[in-house]
């Protein structure tokens, strides 16, 4: 969030000093809250970082994230027979990504037009709420998925209705929790008119009172509760999973599973390194610097980190690919522009041909042949 200096502060500041607080006087006259923006803040708002780099990244996220997560949700809801807990968590992950990504055209337009928000206060609040909501939803559902993957390896029992119901219950609890923790983002006024630039910003300029105290406390709480703790659980689950996979006996099938598990771990690790860790770290550092020094020296890094956090919507489909067989099939066929039905017919005909050949070879030979499809 950008902010500007007041005359007494030294150096380039990104603090939004409020020079008059919004309140209703005894006579019922509303006095406007004023947000300070200085030359440096103005140059960030008009610079290439916010008007070129951000829209490019958001366009990539939208173009990749919308169809891949859309397809994933469709596969998990309508093309997956058994609704395993993993499928339930991935469906929720895909839904969270879609709810965030669908607003990206507005976000892209906002940045391209010089950070000028023309779509009203309510839409700005929705966009910001969904933006942060998606990040924290992704972290929590990824944690559930990671713990569940470990649980499957440790306790490889069949699919039960009870497990699926527990997963649905946990998912609903996560949605409720995220809705509650993002309430402040919906309540706070996010759009501010900057006369000098003739633009209305969305979330990029906030009042100092709100920013210094509340924003630091808010994002620190989220970083600890909804990032660090789930990150610890995710890491623990994968460390234990690696140990289990190392010690288990290796046949061709389990080797494939092991490779997929490693790919999944690498993908989740990449997501944490690119999306979640930098954004959560810089959210806290940025607001801490403003709180303690009156200015943030990491504003550009903070902007980039928040932007990169949206890449989780592009990385999540790789998670689905390594976990879900159904999604893997549909993804491969979508990329090859083939229908699943056609592929299945091809597989059936190939399988029957193979069986007829094999039956003749079995009769002529005394050696047993192990086959796996």
């Amino acid at each position: 969030t950008i902010q500007g200096t007041n005359r007494s502060s030294k150096g380039r500041s990104l603090i939004g000093k409020v020079d008059g607080t919004s309140h209703v006087t005894g006579k019922g006259v509303t006095v406007e809250t004023v947000f300070s923006v200085d030359e440096f803040s103005a140059s960030v708002l008009t610079g290439k970082l916010t008007t070129v780099f951000l829209p490019i990244v958001y366009t990539i996220v939208f173009v990749v994230g919308l169809p891949s997560n859309g397809m994933a949700l469709w596969v998990f809801l309508f093309r997956t027979k058994k609704k395993h807990p993993a499928v339930i968590y991935m469906a929720n992950l895909a839904l969270a990504d879609l709810l965030s990504v669908i607003w990206f055209p507005l976000k892209i337009a906002y940045h391209i037009h010089g950070n000028n928000w023309i779509y009203g206060e309510a839409l700005c609040n929705v966009l910001i709420g969904f933006f942060y909501g998606n990040m924290y939803c992704s972290i929590l559902f990824m944690t559930c998925l990671s713990v569940q993957r470990y649980w499957v390896i440790v306790n490889p029992m069949g699919h039960s209705r009870k497990k699926a119901n527990i997963a649905i219950g946990i998912s609903l609890a996560i949605w409720l929790l995220i809705l509650l923790v993002t309430i402040p983002l919906y309540v706070v006024k996010q759009t501010i008119f900057i006369p000098a630039l003739n633009i209305t910003t969305c979330h990029d300029v906030l009042p100092e009172q709100l920013l210094v105290g509340d924003m630091f406390n808010y994002f620190l709480s989220l970083a600890i509760g909804v990032f660090l703790f789930p990150a610890f659980l995710t890491a623990s689950a994968y460390v234990l999973m690696i140990r289990m996979l190392r010690s288990s006996a290796m046949d061709e099938n389990s080797e494939k599973k092991r490779k997929r598990a490693i790919k999944l771990i690498v993908t989740v690790l990449a997501m944490y390194l690119i999306c979640f860790t930098p954004s959560n770290l810089l959210l806290v550092v940025h607001y801490f610097l403003i709180k303690s020094q009156g200015q943030s020296h990491v504003y550009a890094l903070y902007i980039v980190a928040l932007c990169l956090s949206t890449l989780n919507s592009c990385i999540d489909p790789f998670v689905y690919y390594f976990v879900s067989h159904d999604f893997r099939d549909h993804a491969k066929n979508a990329l090859l522009c083939r229908s699943v039905r056609t592929v299945k017919q091809m597989q059936v005909s190939l399988t029957s041909k193979k069986h007829s050949r094999k039956s003749s070879s079995y009769s002529s030979s005394s050696t047993t042949v192990k086959t796996s499809y």
Partner: antibody, heavy 121, light 107 residues
Framework: EVQLVESGGGLVQPGRSLKLSCVAS????????MTWIRQAPGKGLEWIAS????????FYPDSVKGRFTISRDDAKSTLYLQMNSLRSEDTATYYC??????????????WGQGVMVTVSS | DIQMTQSPHSLSASLGEGVSIECLAS??????LAWFQQKPGKSPQLLIY???SLQDGVPSRFSGSGSGTQYSLKISNMQPEDEGVYYC?????????FGGGTKLELK
């Protein structure tokens, strides 16, 4: 001490062009927005152009849009105003001013001595 | 464009007297108003910004007030050096516009 010194004014025929310059000193030029404001003889003040500290954005009123161009050279701490298709109503004293952004708005806190531009045949 | 109307057009005041100049905007300008003083043959000088904030180096006898569309500049103790033309200017919406000016003379 902040100083703004304009030059390049004079008598010019209608339809012709003229380029005004303003050399700034006493402050970090590339940190500040700059503005041109004019004052017709015996008349009030009229804002005519502004440029951001990065030079990334420029602003003009409709009366000069498409005819006047504001630019800056940070290396030389110089502000320019290129005036094309001049009209008799452009006759005025042109002031180079430093604009400071405070509370989201731009305020003209330092002014040059002004340079006279006369458009006449 | 936002029209800025100043009143009175001119006024004269005695030494030590209090003076008030009014500025009316054609629409609300959210306190984004500046006041300038221009002495004869000189460049204008910023006195007040954001309706009521005193610019550095400006004597405290100058004060600004107002909100919405109505603003005023007050000089509490008229001095000889206060003679000149006073302009209000809105910085809320492009194009930035000035009032027609108020000429202040010493009686």
């Amino acid at each position: 001490e902040v100083q703004l010194v304009e030059s390049g004014g004079g008598l010019v025929q209608p339809g012709r062009s003229l380029k005004l310059s303003c050399v700034a000193s006493g402050f970090t030029f590339n940190n500040k927005w700059m503005t041109w404001i004019r004052q017709a003889p015996g008349k009030g003040l009229e804002w005519i152009a502004s440029i951001t500290n990065t030079g990334g954005r420029t602003f003009y009123p409709d009366s000069v849009k498409g005819r006047f161009t504001i630019s800056r050279d940070d290396a030389k701490s110089t502000l320019y105003l290129q005036m094309n298709s001049l009209r008799s109503e452009d006759t005025a004293t042109y002031y180079c001013t430093r604009a400071t952004i405070r509370r989201g708005a731009s305020y003209f806190d330092y002014w040059g001595q002004g340079v006279m531009v006369t458009v006449s045949s | 464009d936002i029209q800025m109307t100043q009143s009175p057009h001119s006024l004269s005041a005695s030494l030590g007297e209090g003076v008030s100049i009014e500025c009316l905007a054609s629409e609300g300008i959210s306190n984004y108003l500046a006041w300038f003083q221009q002495k004869p043959g000189k460049s204008p000088q910023l006195l007040i910004y954001y309706a009521s904030s005193l610019q550095d180096g400006v004597p405290s006898r100058f004060s600004g007030s107002g909100s919405g569309t109505q603003y005023s500049l007050k000089i509490s103790n008229m001095q000889p050096e206060d003679e000149g033309v006073y302009y209000c200017q809105q910085g809320y919406k492009y194009p930035w516009t000035f009032g027609g000016g108020t000429k202040l003379e010493l009686k």
